[in-house]
């Protein structure tokens, strides 16, 4: 008989050498091969033979090494729930969805199931940048010094105040967190003391 270097092989302690690619089959008390991603179990292993796998049919998938007897059905991203597709379903991977622009994930169960509109940030604030877009609702933070934001918006960013001198203008009113600097043309008339000298 052949040496049991490969499944199926007996396991008394209910553990297998390769946990990712093998599983313990309690009925026969043996370790058997799992099926690779994109496949499923068509024939379970037996005392004399290892697992037999089959490819997932169109519109179905299995993402991991598995001993499932069916493939998971591909599901579309539900626009009613505020989701959009970023990558299609394949035999090895489910459909990849994300929240539509201007929305955040409001319900999470292993993956996002429901998105809601992002809250507006009031004038003088902007949404704090997140590592992952759509992961949470907006957290509004004040504009930093020298910047302003003058709308109620979920996505507007604080902009730097206009520098009047860069445009050949002078400052009429300083900028605030909610408004830009007001600029005006430089005064044309000379100072009064200068005008007397000129008349003479």
């Amino acid at each position: 008989s052949q040496p049991q270097a490969v499944p199926p092989y007996a396991s008394e302690n209910q553990t297998c050498r390769d946990q990712e690619k093998e599983y313990y089959e309690p009925q026969h008390r043996i370790c058997c091969s799992r099926c690779p991603p994109g496949t499923y179990v068509s024939a379970k292993c037996s005392r004399i033979r290892d697992t037999v796998c089959a490819t997932c049919a169109e519109n179905s998938y299995n993402e991991h090494w598995n001993y499932l007897t069916i493939c998971q059905l591909c599901r579309p991203c539900d626009p009613v729930m505020g989701l959009e597709e970023i990558a299609p379903c394949t035999s090895k991977r489910k459909t990849q969805c994300r929240c539509q622009p201007g929305m955040f994930c409001a319900a999470w169960a292993l993956e996002c199931t429901h998105c809601e509109l992002l809250s507006d940030c009031p004038p003088g604030t902007e949404a704090e940048l997140k590592d992952e877009v759509g992961k949470g609702n907006n957290h509004c933070v004040p504009c930093k010094a020298g910047h302003f934001q003058n709308t109620s918006s979920p996505s507007a960013r604080c902009q730097p105040h206009t520098r009047c001198e860069n445009q050949g203008l002078v400052e009429a009113a300083p900028g605030t967190a909610q408004s830009d600097t007001t600029c005006k043309n430089p005064l044309e008339p000379l100072p009064p003391e200068m005008s007397g000298t000129m008349l003479m």
Epitope: A43, K44, R49, V52, A54, T69
Partner: antibody, heavy 113, light 108 residues
Framework: EVQLVESGGGLIQPGGSLRLSCAAS????????MSWVRQAPGKGLEWVSV???????YYGDSVKGRFTISRDNSKNTLYLQMNSLRAEDTAVYFC???????WGPGTLVTVSS | EIVLTQFPGTLSLSPGEGGTLSCRAS???????LAWYQQKPGQAPRLLIY???RRVIGIPDRFSGSGSGTDFNLTISSLEPGDFAVYYC?????????FGQGTRLEIK
């Protein structure tokens, strides 16, 4: 010990119907890959149909639309419903499972007028 | 469907000799899901090899399978009287399973 026993074979006229049964012991039919294979007198093996562990069913081109594979969990039995039988369906029908690990002795189906 | 062609049709050998039976597929067999069976007169076939090269537990190591893609072989070393039979290859990598026409191994 695994055992498979086919029954239901016999002489049938062309166009007639027959249901073959395969009683299994030593394992659970509903949990396993089960198949029917036939062998015409003096000829080679021809695969007929399969039902996977998860319930998917498939058929050979020559029987598609005429034969139906099924299983009864409570009786631990596999079936092959054969309709619109033809002379070329004459063969010994073997039940196999799990997978093709074990085979029954076979049952002879003769389609003749 | 995948057509399997076995050759030779008949192989004549003496006990103690070794021999190789071949099976060619009309297209690539998925995951090398090819099996070999032995059938003696009046009996049901017996599974010997699956997955092209994996011997069923309990089958003597005189039987070995090899090959991949479209070309597969069953090698029997040191033939015993009980080995003379008909051998079939089978692909089960597609949902439409097929058998080869068989090779008769007879005593010379």
């Amino acid at each position: 010990e695994v055992q498979l026993v086919e029954s239901g074979g016999g002489l049938i006229q062309p166009g007639g119907s027959l249901r073959l049964s395969c009683a299994a012991s030593g394992f659970t039919v509903s949990d396993n890959y089960m198949s029917w294979v036939r062998q015409a007198p003096g000829k080679g093996l021809e695969w007929v149909s399969v039902i996977y562990s998860g319930g998917n069913t498939y058929y050979g081109d020559s029987v598609k639309g005429r034969f139906t594979i099924s299983r009864d969990n409570s009786k631990n039995t596999l079936y092959l419903q054969m309709n619109s039988l033809r002379a070329e369906d004459t063969a010994v029908y073997f039940c196999t499972g799990p997978f093709f690990d074990y085979w029954g002795p076979g049952t002879l189906v003769t389609v003749s007028s | 469907e995948i057509v399997l062609t076995q050759f030779p049709g008949t192989l004549s050998l003496s006990p103690g000799e070794g021999g190789t039976l071949s099976c060619r597929a009309s297209q690539t067999v998925w995951s090398n899901y090819l099996a070999w069976y032995q059938q003696k007169p009046g009996q049901a076939p017996r599974l010997l090899i699956y997955g092209a090269s994996r011997r069923v537990i309990g089958i003597p190591d005189r039987f070995s399978g090899s090959g991949s893609g479209t070309d597969f072989n069953l090698t029997i070393s040191s033939l015993e009287p009980g080995d003379f039979a008909v051998y079939y290859c089978q692909q089960y990598g597609s949902s439409s399973i097929t058998f080869g026409q068989g090779t008769r191994l007879e005593i010379k």
